[in-house]
Interface confidence: low
């Protein structure tokens, strides 16, 4: 037999938060355990789930699990079924809601002297106890002009009036927690004497020495005051108005007129009326002076046809917002077609090249009228007038590549030179018709140019083939001067270049036969061995049949190259004595000699009284200090070549000489004594 | 085949910064300019910036000072830094290619449309609230 082990029990359970409804039964065999509730099976929800054979509840709900529970153990090989006592939950709960009139039927039928019943739709249970308040402030039950009935969690103000307006909220508790009213009621009971306004003043905006008028009317019983201030709290009257408001005018029925306004009018005026009870009523308005400002200037336009595009005007600042329309020709643009106006836009679809002109942007409010033009071009696309040719430059000279384009708006010609972008330098030069002017034609020059113009349209482009005509010249030029070592072979090279190949040939300047020993071999000159009578001026003659020829002269000297008889030698002195440093070269040209001190010509002219360069060539330096050492070169040149040769110098303080050395001894170094 | 592919879009706090980045694929990236342009819902596109194949930086006046476009080739990738963003920069970003032969100072100012330039890629949306 299934026995309950555990059976659920009715228990109290608070709304939201956890319950368990606990079951436990003991079977000789396997059973299955499920709940009902109010007979029907209960399915696991994520709130409300079996946990083991209890039922669990995450979140208790006053509506849900309201009913009766009961827990079924069946056995199902059997058939054999059990079922738990009856169990349920007294759920303790409350709700929020407004205050709500009750009594009379609508806010329109409340009158001074009537009664007035307002419910608070707060719920619970167990049933809660209400707390009314009046604009925050507790009412408690008995005072006078009202009842408060807990049962009905009603109040009533009998009879109710001007004292009771206010805002009505309600506040229950119980034993679950407290609630307060989600909603609030506002009670306005008039009281015939307090002031209410009829006619309230608006804010105003009028241009300079304009008129502007504020109306203000309040009504009571009696009638109420009615007194006009100005932004300074100074009062307005017909019989006492502050200087600055000289033209202000007050109306028996409350409207405030203000002439010729100036800017010193403009702020806030205020219109305070006061009835014989209660609060004074004070409505504000402001007195605006219209005012516009300048409007930005537009950029001009670029446009292809065929396009749509939109030009928007960005209105001035002004006050009031200036209202913005568009021109063109003279003529206010319509809201629809195809050139049109769409808000503050300018619109043109489906552009056409007849669109091109000049639009206008018009401003304007109670301050005045402002106007901004726009200059719309229409890009066509850029025609030929004259295309590159393929042309033949001559070199060093010059050239010149058209490309000649016509097209709105002017186009833009870029030069590209094997696919490279030309940039302009000292070289080439685009001017403004699109002409590329190459300033010195080089041999290289000759390849291909395209050239490219271009508007927003769009673009076309050519390309022509540039064949540089070389100039006749020697490549390079031979030098003016040269000279040749005696008793030496020598050789004298002279090539050129030209549209033709050249043939090239040498001959003495006087017109005589080169000697026997002396050969020309494709231009260049070879002596066997130099002898003196091979020194002379000698010509390079290049020639091919369409440039003619070109000479080139050269003046051959013939010498003796130079050598050193005495050269400088490593010299170590003594501080204060004399150092000779010797150098003595022959050549011919009989070669001069130099010398080099530490990094520098020693010019003979400014060497001072310590140093002198004999005719030999020799160097002396007198009273040497330390600051002499270093390196010195001898340097011997002639009008053929230079030639030269160094040796180190040192300066040392000398020895105090030790008993050990005898006398005589040598000093550890070559040292030059004086 | 030819594919512009924008990344680096979401969300920011106005004051903030973004860095959008388009990487371009099947053309020759160098010989083309770049451009940069947004669409705000039921707006137009808007074009905000340009750096051309030499490049030559342009920008549109709502962006001046605040946005700055650079490119690098080796990556052929373009870059849009956004800072000092607004809620009014709320948009869907678009990368555009350009082969054409009109300078692309004309072509900033005149010309809207998705017609007016030769690739796009698919947008990344950038969201700025206060």
């Known amino acids: 037999a299934i026995v309950f082990i555990k059976q659920p029990s009715s228990q109290d359970a608070l709304q939201g938060r956890r319950a368990l409804l606990r079951c436990e039964v003991e079977a000789p065999g396997p059973v299955h355990v499920y709940w009902l509730l109010d007979g029907a099976p209960v399915q696991d929800t994520e709130r409300r789930f079996a946990q083991g054979s209890s039922l669990s509840f995450a979140a208790v709900d006053r509506l849900q699990d309201s009913g009766t529970f009961q827990c079924v153990a069946r056995d199902d090989v059997t058939g054999e079924e059990a079922r738990s006592a009856n169990a349920s939950f007294n759920i303790k709960w409350i709700e929020a809601g407004p205050v709500v009139l009750k009594h009379p039927a609508s806010e329109a039928e409340i009158q001074p002297q009537t009664q007035v019943t307002l419910r608070c739709h707060i719920d619970g249970h167990p049933r809660p106890t209400y707390q009314w308040f009046r604009d925050g402030t507790p009412l408690s039950d008995g005072q006078s002009n009202h009842t408060v009935s807990s049962k009905e969690r009603n109040l009533t103000l009998r009879p109710a009036g001007p004292e009771h307006s206010g805002l009505y909220s309600c506040c229950a508790h119980s034993a679950f927690g407290q609630a307060c009213s989600s909603q609030n009621f506002t009670l306005s009971i008039a009281d015939e004497s307090f002031a209410r306004v009829v006619l309230a003043p608006q804010d105003v905006v009028v241009a300079r020495y304009e008129e502007a008028m504020f109306h203000c009317q309040f009504s009571a019983q009696p009638p109420p005051s009615l007194q006009w201030l100005f932004e300074d709290e100074t009062p307005i009257t017909n019989r006492s108005r502050p200087p600055h408001l000289r033209r202000a005018t007050v109306f028996a029925n409350g409207s405030l007129l203000l002439t010729q306004v100036r800017p010193r009018n403009a702020g806030i005026y205020r219109c305070i009326g006061q009835g014989q009870r209660g609060p004074p009523i004070i409505l504000e308005a402001t007195l605006h002076l219209a005012e516009i400002e300048d409007m930005p200037l537009f950029e001009p336009r670029v446009f292809t046809a065929g396009s749509e595009e939109r030009v928007t005007c960005l209105p001035p600042k002004g006050l009031p917002e200036p209202s913005v329309w568009w021109e063109h020709a003279g003529v206010r643009l319509p809201t629809h077609g195809r050139v049109y106006q769409k808000g503050h836009e300018l619109v043109l679809a489906n552009i056409a090249e007849s669109d091109a002109g000049v639009y206008t942007c018009h401003a304007a409010n109670l301050a005045g009228q402002r106007r901004q033009d726009v200059n719309i071009t229409v890009a066509t696309v850029p025609s030929w007038l004259k295309k590159p040719q393929d042309s033949q430059l001559e070199e060093g000279k010059p050239g010149y590549l058209d490309c000649l384009t016509q097209a709105t708006p002017k186009p833009t010609v870029v030069w590209y030179r094997n696919q490279m972008l030309i940039s302009e330098d000292s070289r080439f030069e685009v001017f403004k018709n699109g002409t590329l002017r190459i300033n010195s034609v080089e041999v290289y020059d000759g390849t291909w140019y395209r050239c490219m113009s271009s508007t927003p349209a769009g673009s076309i482009e050519a390309q022509a083939r540039v064949q540089v005509l070389e100039k006749l010249k020697f490549t390079p030029p031979p030098q003016p001067q040269q000279c040749m070592e005696f008793d030496k072979e020598a050789t004298v090279p002279c090539s050129a270049t030209g549209r033709e190949k050249p043939t090239i040939k040498w001959e003495r300047a006087d017109g005589s036969s080169l000697p026997e020993w002396v050969t020309d071999n494709a231009g260049t000159l070879h002596f066997a061995r130099v002898t003196r009578d091979d020194a002379g001026n000698y010509t390079c003659i290049a020639s091919n049949g369409p440039q003619g020829q070109i000479r080139a002269h050269v003046q051959l000297t013939v010498a003796v190259f130079i050598t050193f008889k005495v050269e400088p030698e490593r010299t170590t002195v003594y501080q204060g004595h004399t150092a000779l440093l010797q150098c003595e070269a022959q050549g011919d040209p009989k070669p001069l000699i130099q010398w080099k001190g530490k990094d520098r010509i020693l010019d003979p002219t400014k060497l001072g009284p310590r140093m002198h360069i004999f005719q030999n060539g020799s160097l002396v330096i007198h009273d040497v200090a330390p600051e002499d050492s270093g390196r010195y070169t001898c340097i011997a040149g002639n009008s053929c070549n230079i030639k030269h040769t160094e040796a180190p110098l040192y300066v040392v303080d000398k020895p105090v000489p030790e008993e050990s050395e005898g006398p005589g001894s040598p000093p550890p170094y070559k040292m030059i004594q004086t | 085949q030819v594919q512009l592919q924008e990344s680096g879009g979401g969300s920011v706090q106005a004051g903030g910064s973004l860095r959008l980045s388009c990487t371009a694929s099947g053309f020759t990236f160098d010989d083309y300019d770049m451009v940069w342009y947004r669409q705000a819902p039921g707006n137009e596109y808007e074009w905000l910036s340009t750096v051309s194949r030499g490049g030559n930086l342009y920008y549109a006046d709502s962006v001046k000072g605040r946005f700055t476009i650079s490119r690098d080739n080796a990556k052929n990738t373009v870059y849009l830094n956004m800072s000092r963003v607004k809620p009014e920069d709320t948009a869907v970003y678009y990368c555009?290619?350009?082969?054409?032969?009109?300078?692309?100072?004309?072509?900033?100012?005149?010309?809207?449309?998705?017609?007016?330039?030769?690739?796009w890629g698919q947008g990344t949306q950038v969201t700025v609230s206060s």
């Open positions: 555009a290619a350009d082969l054409r032969s009109v300078p692309s100072t004309y072509r900033a100012r005149t010309c809207r449309g998705r017609y007016c330039r030769d690739y």
